[in-house]
């Protein structure tokens, strides 16, 4: 295999036109890659809005916080951050808005301290199932990741593979059970139509889950039962029509939970009765007084908390012989 090596230079805020002495030796502690800014004191490297097309191979070994935002990376291959010596201190990696369309298996291997990863605002048409686990073993070595930010990673319609985008993302989250220690997961703004039923049960350490601004219609098959540590659940700006008894009971049973349900098109018919009753009693829903009906037309903009059972009726279902086309 080929391997990246390091270019050593004496400036800490790089100038692209300064020649740097390239060597096959380990990087010098004060080096800074071209087009990046480095602070050894803050253990931070920022390569921001520089149209980089690759991850620099000459990253300083001291880096703890790496910002590679606003670039044109396109692809993260296996071992994209593997270095000799390894980037053993790297704890926070932000790759948002860098036009990534492919993240390959093992892209984040050899980062033993990586706790926060942000891949938001990249059109990830091809996210390997083993992007985070690094191997295709049924049980992988645990990932150190605690926070995974995947907001707005849905590619344009014409760039999607012939498969479920939700399924692709969930496969990467569940592979090898590597993310058992994950505490924060953000999946906002991804056009999710559904949440595969396995996903939450296999992320038992979650404290914060953001599913806002998706297209979720129902949570009927989603179980929150195992998420005993869950503190916040963001479901704003989805397409939820009603929450059914099973979901309500599970949410109520979570000891630390706060749920956010604003801006969903609640259907205020007879199926809403249990949810309205629950809303009136529960303390877990933040801003519950802002929740309003969207349908049927006669109920539009009515506040859920102000409804009573008499308001929540369903039109009778006509026998087939009386139905009109």
């Amino acid at each position: 295999s080929s391997s990246p090596t390091s270019s050593a230079s004496s400036f800490s805020s790089s100038a692209p036109f300064l020649a740097s002495a390239v060597s096959a030796q380990p990087p010098l502690p004060d080096q800074c890659p071209a087009l990046c800014e480095c602070s050894e004191a803050a253990r931070t490297v920022k390569c921001v809005n520089r149209n980089l097309t690759e991850v620099p191979t000459d990253l300083p070994a001291y880096v703890r916080n790496l910002f590679l935002t606003g670039n044109q990376l396109a692809v993260l291959p296996a071992g994209a951050f593997a270095r000799r010596p390894p980037l053993a201190e790297l704890a926070a990696l932000n790759l948002s808005g860098s036009r990534l369309d492919e993240v390959r298996a093992g892209a984040f291997e050899h980062l033993p301290s990586l706790r926060q990863l942000d891949l938001s605002h990249n059109p990830l048409a091809d996210l390997s199932p083993f992007a985070f686990s690094g191997s295709n073993a049924s049980v992988s070595a645990p990932s150190p990741l605690v926070e995974l930010i995947l907001n707005h990673i849905v590619p344009p319609e014409d760039e999607r593979q012939n498969r479920s985008f939700e399924g692709m993302v969930v496969a990467a989250l569940l592979a090898g059970r590597a993310l058992q220690g994950l505490r924060r997961l953000e999946l906002a703004s991804n056009h999710f139509l559904y949440l595969p039923r396995d996903v939450l049960a296999q992320l038992p350490s979650l404290r914060h889950l953001d599913l806002s601004n998706n297209s979720l219609v129902s949570l009927t098959y989603v179980s929150f039962r195992n998420l005993t540590h869950l503190e916040s659940l963001h479901l704003e700006d989805n397409a939820l029509k009603v929450l059914h008894n099973g979901t309500l009971a599970e949410l109520q049973g979570l000891p630390h939970i706060r749920v956010f349900l604003d801006n969903n098109p609640w259907v205020c018919d007879c199926h809403m009765a249990d949810m309205v009753t629950w809303l009136k009693e529960t303390e877990v829903v933040q801003g519950k007084d802002r929740l309003t009906c969207a349908y049927p037309e006669k109920m539009r903009n009515r506040v859920l908390l102000e409804l009573n059972s008499a308001d929540l009726d369903c039109d009778p279902i006509l026998p087939p012989s009386l139905q009109t086309s």
Partner: antibody, heavy 121, light 107 residues
Framework: EVQLVESGGGLVQPGGSLRLSCAAS????????MNWVRQAPGKGLEWVSY????????YYADSVKGRFTISRDNAKNSLYLQMNSLRDEDTAVYYC??????????????WGRGTLVTVSS | DIQMTQSPSSLSASVGDRVTITCRAS??????LNWFQQKPGKAPNLLIY???ILQSGVPSRFSGSGSGTDFTLTISSLQPEDFATYYC?????????FGGGTKVEIK
């Protein structure tokens, strides 16, 4: 004219050193990544090394890692390959080749004519 | 490393023949496969990149196809100037690797 011209090849003893140069002209050298590719006599092509446009991303083939060093000087429109601890198996014609914006998903769309390196005692 | 295997290693053909050269990767390389032509004593010349895109100035009798692990270079009607050695090369991952070459000779 758009071209690449290699120089610096020659006969060298095992364990010796050579520095190859590649002079670029007719295009904006600083906008392109560059590569060295070699071809042993009567054999196929072997990629040797890659450097991106701003010298912050560099890759080597395992066969030369730790012995060869790629570098460039955009002000001089020049690419270099410093070859140390040369071995018999390094005998080859060395080509410089222009790449795209990254090592992956790219292709060599412009080649020099090559310079012959012979390692022999 | 990804191994690239070309077949055949050599072939004899006549002017006007349709010639097909195959290249197989040891693992998937998506569509990141390039083809080069090399004549004796000369540098290689890019023919096709990303499986099927014809490099500017290359005659349309050359075409490429395939995806994943199996790829093909086709010369629809062999011309006298096409007698040469052809190499495939993957740019899916480093190290970049070439096939062993296919020598097209005059029958």
């Amino acid at each position: 004219e758009v071209q690449l011209v290699e120089s610096g090849g020659g006969l060298v003893q095992p364990g010796g050193s050579l520095r190859l140069s590649c002079a670029a002209s007719g295009f904006t050298f600083s906008s392109y990544s560059m590569n060295w590719v070699r071809q042993a006599p009567g054999k196929g092509l072997e990629w040797v090394s890659y450097i991106n446009s701003v010298s912050n991303t560099i890759y080597y083939a395992d066969s030369v890692k730790g012995r060869f060093t790629i570098s460039r000087d955009n002000a001089k429109n020049s690419l270099y390959l410093q070859m140390n601890s040369l071995r018999d198996e390094d005998t080859a014609v060395y080509y410089c080749a222009r790449g795209g914006v990254r090592v992956l998903r790219s292709y060599f769309d412009l080649w020099g004519r090559g310079t012959l390196v012979t390692v022999s005692s | 490393d990804i191994q690239m295997t070309q077949s055949p290693s050599s072939l004899s053909a006549s002017v006007g023949d349709r010639v097909t050269i195959t290249c197989r990767a040891s693992q998937t390389i998506s569509s990141y496969l390039n083809w080069f032509q090399q004549k004796p004593g000369k540098a290689p010349n890019l023919l096709i990149y990303t499986t099927s895109i014809l490099q500017s100035g290359v005659p349309s009798r050359f075409s490429g196809s395939g995806s994943g692990t199996d790829f093909t270079l086709t010369i629809s009607s062999l011309q006298p100037e096409d007698f040469a050695t052809y190499y495939c090369q993957q740019s899916y991952s480093t190290p970049l690797t070439f096939g062993g070459g296919t020598k097209v000779e005059i029958k």
